[in-house]
């Protein structure tokens, strides 16, 4: 039975050209995490495997950094980075847990005028 829950940073915004940390946390379960996949829509961004460590997908190598922890740092943000991001926890024995984060990348001027939001 899957008892765990994923807590995420929820809906976040960041400035174009800046960076943002995507963070998920699995709680309320004793399941062991074998691997965490980070995906944008259906595209793989990165993998953190308990045995083999981190892998950043080739198309994102220049702009994605592993961590902190099981999180992911997106750098040099563009408006095209706006969208849904998913952390997928592969665990034993529970199975798969998925968390969702919505990122909005704003033009710097808009962000400076207080349009930044964060919903837990």
């Amino acid at each position: 039975m899957m008892t765990g829950t994923i807590e995420t940073t929820g809906n976040i915004s960041a400035e174009k050209g800046g960076s943002i940390i995507l963070q998920c946390h699995l709680s309320s379960t004793t399941a062991q995490v074998t691997q965490v996949n980070w995906e944008q829509q259906d595209q793989l961004l990165a993998i953190c495997n308990a045995d083999l460590g981190w892998h950043i997908s080739p198309s994102f190598k220049d702009r994605v950094a592993p961590g902190p922890g099981l999180g992911l740092t997106l750098q040099s943000l563009t408006v095209n980075d706006t969208g849904e991001y998913f952390c997928i926890y592969h665990t034993y024995p529970d199975g798969t847990y998925t968390g969702r984060i919505f990122l909005e990348v704003l033009e710097s001027s808009v962000a400076e005028h207080g349009a930044r939001f964060q919903i837990p």
Partner: antibody
């Protein structure tokens, strides 16, 4: 269509060398852990070696350690197995295999195999 | 070295249900070890062909594999069940598991399934 195509097998004398290649197509090669698995005539499957996404981590079966070297060229979507100091017991069909995105889950795509015969 | 043990042969008649067992030493399946020791996969090898993945992650079926094939796992033992047996199911079946302690994959010896 996801495909793996092995080549490089043949007849070699004991003590000789051979390099097997596996050309991958239909998937983002860089994002997957790969393995070589062999099958001696009339026998079962035996795992030979595994390589991570970048090639920085490699594992070997005890029976080939120190003699075989696994490598990959992600720019060419190709997996290799360099086999040195070959013995009669290395005679087998050699398969390359793509792992599931969580590599511990299993090997989801296999090539058709290439035959290696070690004999004088 | 860890070992996965399978019966060398199994048989059944068309329409029947057959199960193939795969028992392992504690370190490659038993639940008291860390997660990457636990995943059992099953492969079908028809005569003269490459192996094909039937079950991954103990119980998951890849797309395209009929739901007649199912996997289960309990403690140090895993099992592949085939229901509604068909003549084309006649093949060798192999279980495998990642052995995290040894950083290696271990295959069972294989089971030859005969459809009578």
């Amino acid at each position: 269509e996801v495909q793996l195509l092995e080549s490089g097998g043949g007849l070699v004398q004991p003590g000789g060398s051979l390099r097997l290649s596996c050309a991958a197509s239909g998937f983002t090669f860089d994002d997957y852990v790969m393995s070589w698995v062999r099958q001696a005539p009339g026998k079962g499957l035996e795992w030979v070696s595994l390589i991570n996404w970048s090639g920085g981590t490699t594992y070997y079966a005890d029976s080939v350690k120190g003699r075989f070297t696994i490598s990959r060229d992600n720019s060419k979507n190709t997996l290799y197995l360099q086999m040195n100091s070959l013995r009669a017991e290395d005679t087998a069909v050699y398969y390359c295999a793509k792992h599931w995105i969580v590599y511990q889950y299993g090997m989801d795509v296999w090539g058709q195999g290439t035959t290696v015969t070690v004999s004088s | 070295q860890s070992v996965l043990t399978q019966p060398s042969s199994a048989s059944g008649t068309p329409g029947q249900r057959v199960a193939i067992s795969c028992s392992g030493t504690i370190s490659n399946i038993e639940t008291k070890y860390v997660s990457w020791y636990k995943y059992v996969s099953w492969y079908q090898q028809l005569p003269g062909t490459a192996p094909k993945l039937l079950i991954y992650n103990n119980v998951q079926r890849p797309s395209g594999v009929p739901d007649r094939f199912s996997g289960s796992q309990s403690g140090t033992s895993a099992s592949l069940a085939i229901s509604g047996l068909q003549s084309e199911d006649e093949a060798h079946y192999y279980c495998a598991s990642w052995e995290g302690g040894l950083n290696s994959w271990v295959f069972g010896g294989g089971t030859k399934l005969t459809v009578l």
